[in-house]
């Protein structure tokens, strides 16, 4: 090995990650909130639709308190990843009456990637043990219907909307822990 | 500029212990988890171990599960890798690495040799 | 034997497009974990080269890029020059080994 030399700093370090994946899921929220307006006013939803397969939500405004990063990012990835999924699936998977909202279901995949993307890197770059990606719990079969598959696209976007809304206010509260 | 600083190598017999130590600088050491990695002469990068960013996790290769303990010390920006019963197969160039690992040391020949 | 498989030459011409491959199983690359590309000249320590599969750090010149597709990922290295002469090895995370695990190493050769 050559004499002791300095490395330049990469283009981020896990605070800035952090930040990052704050901005990222703040931007994903709005995304989801505005996707979820638009289907309940296309597809008045009569009620709550749930699916079996989709992650229960992990954490209630009561938990923020104890919260630690560990169990944070590994529950908060392996959700993303799950909802990721069936946002997948759904693109497959719909109607030709939800076809109208392709779009919008397209860029909501891409960053809910992106954001995967930088809660892997964060995890990294701690070395917080990473789990193995969860497979939905319930295989994702064709919806039984086209009313099936707007059912679903609700429970979805209803599930991702809670779902980001407890991790942006988990991920500002880790941020005065690291 | 980011630094890391290798120390403690050198030639031991079989079945010895070594303390090797890495000094950070010039990123913020405590918000990074750390690893350890070797290369065997002629060889390429083996992974030895890794602890988290605020040491309550550590995970180690099979080669060197329960011989080798890695630990850190935040107020010192001190990283350490204890080598214990050591066998002619540990001897490489062990680096010191932070982050993904983001950044390398340039590393310190350890030599188990009698 | 190391967990994700690399060739162990490659060869190219200055100016030429080289591509290295690396090969991982379900416990890694195809479990949806980020590969790392590092870059070990000859006598020198490692340096990262490409992170989170396709990103490149601060300093590192846009000829190299990254990409990964099911438990396989490759760096491409465009307008081939003397000076990228190097090791190369792809990285991981590994959630059967609870950590990082490296390629075997690429020896690209500038002809």
């Known amino acids: 090995p050559g004499p002791p030399a300095g490395s330049p700093r990469v283009s981020s370090d896990p605070r800035a990650d952090l930040d990052s994946a704050v901005l990222l899921t703040r931007s994903l929220l709005a995304d989801t909130r505005q996707l979820a307006a638009q289907m309940r006013d296309k597809f008045p939803a009569d009620g709550d639709h749930n699916l079996d397969s989709l992650p229960t939500l992990a954490m209630s405004a009561g938990t923020l308190g104890s919260l630690q990063l560990p169990g944070v990012l590994t529950r908060l990835r392996v959700d993303l990843m799950s909802y990721f999924r069936h946002v997948q699936w759904l693109r497959r998977a719909a109607g030709p009456s939800l076809k109208t909202l392709e779009p919008e279901l397209g860029a909501l995949q891409a960053r809910l990637e992106r954001l995967l993307r930088r809660l892997q890197l964060l995890m990294s770059r701690l070395a917080l043990p990473q789990a193995a990606p969860d497979q939905p719990a319930v295989p994702l079969g064709p919806p039984a219907s086209a009313w099936g598959s707007i059912r679903a696209a609700h429970a979805i976007l209803g599930g991702l909307h809670l779902t980001l809304d407890w991790a942006v206010r988990g991920l500002l509260l880790l941020k005065t822990r690291l | 500029e980011v630094q890391l600083l290798e120390s403690g190598g050198g030639l031991v017999q079989p079945g010895g212990s070594l303390r090797l130590s890495c000094a950070a600088s010039?990123?913020?050491?405590?918000?990074?988890?750390m690893h350890w990695v070797r290369q065997a002469p002629g060889k390429g990068l083996e992974w030895v171990a890794v602890i988290s960013y605020d040491g309550s996790y550590k995970y180690y290769a099979d080669s060197v599960k329960g011989r080798f303990t890695i630990s850190r010390d935040n107020s010192k920006n001190t990283l350490y890798l204890q080598m214990n019963s050591l066998r002619a197969e540990d001897t490489a160039v062990y680096y010191c690495?932070?982050?993904?690992?983001?950044?390398w040391g340039q590393g310190t020949l350890v030599t188990v040799s009698s | 034997q190391s967990v994700l498989t690399q060739p162990p030459s490659a060869s190219g011409t200055p100016g030429q497009r080289v591509t290295i491959s690396c090969s991982g199983s379900s416990s890694n690359i195809g479990s949806d974990y980020d590969v790392h590309w590092y870059q070990q000249l000859p006598g020198t320590a490692p340096k990262l080269l490409i992170y989170s599969n396709n990103e490149r750090p601060s300093g590192v010149p846009d000829r190299f890029s990254g990409s990964k597709s099911g438990t396989s990922a490759s760096l491409a290295i465009s307008g081939l020059r003397s000076e990228d002469e190097a090791d190369y090895y792809c990285a991981a995370w590994d959630f059967s080994l609870y950590g990082p695990v490296f390629g075997g190493g690429t020896k690209l050769t500038v002809l």
């Open positions: 690495a932070a982050g993904v690992p983001d950044y």
């Open positions: 010039g990123f913020t050491f405590s918000s990074y988890g």
